[in-house]
Interface confidence: low
């Protein structure tokens, strides 16, 4: 058993048929000593007397508010959570695996620039009695320290017979240096809670490796004179790293036809500027990545043709 | 060329020899994302790779102040990883295969790092730890750990040649 | 060769003040961040607080915040904490060092400085 805050407590136990579980004791958080009772959540019935009361925990009825009383009053409260493992592996039953990039990602990451700033989300069934608290260092054997906000619902999706709720927290590193190669990855760890179920979660990376920009801006078409072709050009994400001589990005640039069959055009250019040929019912979109390091492709930036 | 006493490096060389690096590191070892190789005990193997770290001036207000702290911290990595490339780790079976980026990513880092520092001069280079893995399936390992980990430093080193390319060249 | 000396360290009432300072040399102190850690009597050693390469911005933890500031002189490679209304649990030997990503994953610490608060 373990604090996870104060008056909440999390039993770890093995979950399998007719397991022993864990025996528990605990104290009422008062000088009082005699005539003292202990209830749990909404029941009357009393489980025990006196300043202390041992119980064995082994299933969900087990776990939930302990309250000891004494004459009517209120004397103070432990939560009791469970945190299960299932043949030597602790359960994910909260959030949902999002199998991208591979399977068991539970945690996704993206990072705009390189200032120390990044969001991660999740998703899960889960509508009701849910809560998550989200704990970040960079390196864990001598943490430095990244401060997260509170994890907000920000999207609610149907898929199905079910809707799927997703979660985010964004994070910042206390002390971020843009230029540095890591050496030290970031960690996440996201503390979920469903009604009396206990379950962690952990995501380790690099900066580098979670970098995504945003799509870059004011994408404009300038028809060359006689000719099919257009100059298209384009400006630097405004959330990305500056200096750009020093933080470049890499663009891609392609000319697709309405019909998603057809032949895709693709340029490649370190410019904020090149010259392809505009066919009709056309879209021209461009992308961007970092120009030193293959971290992911931003969204597409498009424009008609016409 | 950044030679000890402080002179300017040939930024421009320097920057287009860095990207072609990057080019290379990222042929060799594509796999971004889909082999988490941290989580194969990295401890003992990335410890000693020389980092470039805050603190050794590769930002742009440090390559502005004075660009020597970052060249010589960068010149101590492509020896270092020069080395490792040149290394039984990536001479050892099992073989690369001929036309495998390695052999040509092994010259461009000889030749950036001769760029940074001509004949004669020396800075002092960071010891290559002795990493001699027994089996192939190791070595396989600690090459793919390399190439993440000289992805990270040559893109760094991209970033300062470029800037200083573009906002340094007398 | 990278060094961190701390100083200005002693005994001081409940409710005193005291300035530490850390010098550096052997790296470009100018761009890097630094911190204050402590480390109390039997405990691990813990962030106090951290100023970025320009001293504009600066991050302290709850436990100090309001009583402890932190400031740097880059043309003097010192970076200062200066500590108010000391509590006795502020007892701990104060060390600096940069917050970033250390020096490798084997970080270098200076010898530290014992400040010591009690009546």
């Known amino acids: 058993i373990w604090e996870l805050k104060k008056d909440v407590y999390v039993v770890e136990l093995d979950w399998y048929p007719d397991a022993p579980g864990e025996m528990v004791v605990l104290t009422c958080d008062t000088p009082e000593e005699d005539g003292i009772t202990w209830t749990l959540d909404q029941s009357s019935e009393v489980l025990g007397s006196g300043k202390t009361l041992t119980i064995q925990v082994k299933e969900f009825g087990d776990a939930g508010q302990y309250t000891c009383h004494k004459g009517g009053e209120v004397l103070s409260h432990s939560l009791l959570l469970l945190h299960k493992k299932e043949d030597g592996i602790w359960s994910t039953d909260i959030l949902k695996d999002q199998k991208e990039p591979k399977n068991k990602t539970f945690l996704r990451c993206e990072a705009k620039n390189y200032s120390g700033r990044f969001t991660c989300w999740w998703l899960t069934t889960i509508s009701t009695d849910l809560t998550f608290s989200v704990k970040s260092s960079r390196g864990s054997s001598d943490p430095q320290g990244v401060t997260c906000g509170a994890a907000t619902l920000s999207a609610e999706r149907v898929r199905g017979d079910n809707k799927e709720y997703e979660y985010s927290v964004e994070c910042q590193e206390d002390s971020a240096c843009p230029a540095a190669e890591e050496s030290l990855p970031i960690e996440v760890m996201v503390d979920a809670v469903h009604k009396l179920k206990y379950e962690n979660y952990t995501s380790s990376f690099f900066i580098r490796d979670i970098i995504k920009p945003d799509p870059p801006k004011n994408l404009q078409l300038k028809p060359l004179k006689n000719s099919r072709q257009v100059e298209v050009s384009w400006e630097y994400p405004d959330t990305w790293s500056t200096p750009h001589s020093y933080f470049s990005l890499t663009f891609c640039v392609q000319v697709q036809g309405k019909s998603k069959r057809e032949k895709k055009d693709r340029v490649f250019t370190d410019k904020t500027s090149a010259t392809v040929i505009c066919r009709k019912n056309a879209s021209i979109s461009v992308r961007a990545q970092d120009r030193y390091y293959s971290s992911s492709w931003s969204e597409w930036a498009s424009v008609p043709c016409s | 060329r950044a030679v000890p006493g402080g002179s300017s490096p040939a930024w421009t060389q320097c920057q287009q020899l860095s990207q072609k690096l990057c080019t290379l590191a990222w042929s060799a070892h594509p796999l971004v994302g889909h082999m988490d190789l941290r989580e194969e005990g990295d401890e003992e193997t990335t410890n000693d790779v020389p980092h470039i770290q805050c603190g050794d001036g590769c930002d742009p207000q440090g390559l502005r102040d004075n660009s020597q702290f970052c060249l010589q911290r960068i010149h101590q990595g492509l020896i270092f990883y020069e080395k490792l490339l040149g290394s039984d780790i990536f001479t050892g079976e099992p073989s690369l295969l001929p036309d495998s980026p390695v052999g040509q990513l092994h010259a461009s880092l000889l030749g950036l790092s001769q760029l940074l520092q001509p004949e004669g001069h020396h800075w002092e280079t960071q010891q290559i730890p002795s990493l001699s893995p027994s089996q192939p399936w190791q070595r396989l390992l600690l090459r793919f750990k390399i190439l993440r980990s000289l992805q990270a430093f040559v893109a760094v080193a991209a970033r300062v040649f470029a800037h200083g390319a573009a906002t340094l060249s007398p | 060769q990278l060094q961190l000396v701390e100083s200005g360290g002693g005994l001081v009432q409940p409710g005193g003040s005291l300035r530490l300072s850390c010098v550096a040399s052997g790296f470009a102190f100018s761009t890097y961040a630094m911190a204050w850690y402590r480390q109390r009597p039997g405990k691990e050693r813990e962030l106090v607080g951290s100023?970025?390469?320009?001293?504009?911005?600066?991050h302290y933890v709850d436990a100090v915040k309001g009583r402890f500031t932190i400031s740097r002189d880059n043309a003097k490679n010192t970076v200062y904490l200066q500590m108010n209304v000391l509590k006795p649990e502020d007892t701990a030997v104060y060390y600096c060092n940069s917050p970033n990503t250390g020096w490798g994953t084997r970080r270098y610490w200076g010898q530290g400085t014992q400040v010591t608060v009690s009546s």
């Open positions: 100023i970025d390469s320009s001293g504009d911005n600066t």
